[in-house]
């Protein structure tokens, strides 16, 4: 049996960002499990004093696109599209610096989901990064277009 499937997103937690678009899942049953866990994580985040407004504005959609990445329509085999590295780095190092420190020291918050690691993402100018998922972080936009 192959690992990796493209299937329509059927959840609620990330519907405002993903709609019913096709997402990549590592196994057929993963979507339901991750949906339950991201719902629990968002509930926890919503009641947390550790999350600033400037962080949550972009961290929530970023987490959704990371947990349920769009399928790469240009690939002949099921393949996820990654977050854009420049946005990932601004999120981790600027907008959500204290939140990331807290999350890294409390890995159980995201349960089955790992915290995104920006080092794992292709460099912005590489061919692999051409199809990355852009959240629309203003500083990253500026950096992306002027460098």
């Amino acid at each position: 049996e192959e690992d990796g499937f493209c299937q329509p997103y059927r959840g609620i937690a990330c519907a405002r960002f993903i709609g019913n678009r096709t997402v990549y899942m590592e196994s057929l049953h993963m979507q339901g499990e991750i949906e339950n866990q991201i719902t629990a994580a968002f509930t926890m985040i919503g009641t947390s004093s550790h999350l600033s407004d400037k962080c949550s504005q972009f961290a929530i959609p970023s987490l959704c696109h990371y947990a349920f990445p769009y399928c790469d329509e240009t690939s002949s085999v099921p393949k996820p599209r990654d977050l854009c590295r420049d946005e990932c780095e601004i999120l981790e190092n600027v907008l959500c610096q204290t939140e990331y420190i807290f999350a890294r020291s409390n890995p159980m918050i995201l349960m089955r989901l790992k915290l995104p690691n920006c080092e794992d993402l292709p460099q912005p100018e590489s061919p692999e990064a051409a199809n990355c998922i852009r959240i629309g972080i203003p500083m990253a936009d500026h950096h992306h277009h002027h460098h």
């Epitope: 690992d3 099921p78 020291s105 890995p107 089955r112 790992k114 080092e119 292709p122 460099q123």
Partner: antibody, heavy 120, light 109 residues
């Protein structure tokens, strides 16, 4: 079916080089870390290093730093372990294993291993 | 470099509950060590059982569970079966490297 197949092992003299391959099938390595782990005869496991094939980002054990290099070719869905300046203590069966970048799944699939013998 | 220590051998009976532990020389094992448990069966057949302290890999029977007990990571087999006879390795993450324990040989008699 998910499979990892190592190849490239063999007998090599101290100071020599070998390149091991880990060919993946049934999944796309860009969504995973590929680890190299070794087991010396009659001993336990030792982590050698890992790569995120998507970006080329690597980590490796102190015992192999400066001698071993991990790389990947995503178009071939294959990871590599380039071993230089080999020593007798590098004699072991070398395994590759996968670990999801996105989800905590443990190192669920392993290859069958390839034996590297360093001896004069 | 950290040293990870496991019981060298344990014996249990079918149906019994057995707990294997994994200690770190640097202090208490925490969730940030992302404890992994790997099973080695004869002929060097390795399977990942548990990741991130307590997450079972897909397809792993529910009798295997991971946790933290005191200052150690633990693998508990609830209702051991004869096919669980194997060597079990734990691996802990230390910021930028993984360190394996020496392995526990579990005999199910």
């Amino acid at each position: 079916e998910v499979q990892l197949v190592e190849s490239g092992g063999g007998l090599v003299q101290p100071g020599g080089s070998l390149r091991l391959s880990c060919a993946a099938s049934g999944f796309n390595i860009t969504g995973y870390y590929i680890h190299w782990v070794r087991q010396a005869p009659g001993k336990g496991l030792e982590w050698v290093g890992q790569i995120s094939p998507n970006s080329g980002s690597t980590y490796s054990a102190d015992s192999v730093k400066g001698r071993f290099t991990i790389s990947a070719d995503t178009s071939k869905n294959t990871a590599y372990l380039q071993m230089n300046s080999l020593r007798a203590e590098d004699t072991a069966v070398y395994y590759c294993a996968r670990d999801s970048r996105r989800y905590v799944l443990s190192w669920d699939y392993w290859g069958q291993g390839t034996l590297v013998t360093v001896s004069s | 470099q950290a040293v990870v220590t496991q019981e060298s051998a344990l014996t249990t009976s079918p149906g019994e509950t057995v707990t294997l532990t994994c200690r770190s020389s640097t202090g208490a094992v925490t969730t940030s060590n992302y404890a992994n448990w790997v099973q080695e069966k004869p002929d060097h057949l390795f399977t990942g059982l548990i990741g991130g302290t307590n997450k079972r890999a897909p397809g792993v029977p529910a009798r295997f569970s991971g946790s933290l007990i005191g200052d150690k990571a633990a693998l508990t087999i609830t209702g051991a079966q004869t096919e669980d006879e194997a060597i079990y390795f734990c691996a802990l993450w230390y910021s930028n490297l993984w360190v394996f324990g020496g392995g526990t040989k579990l005999t199910v008699l």
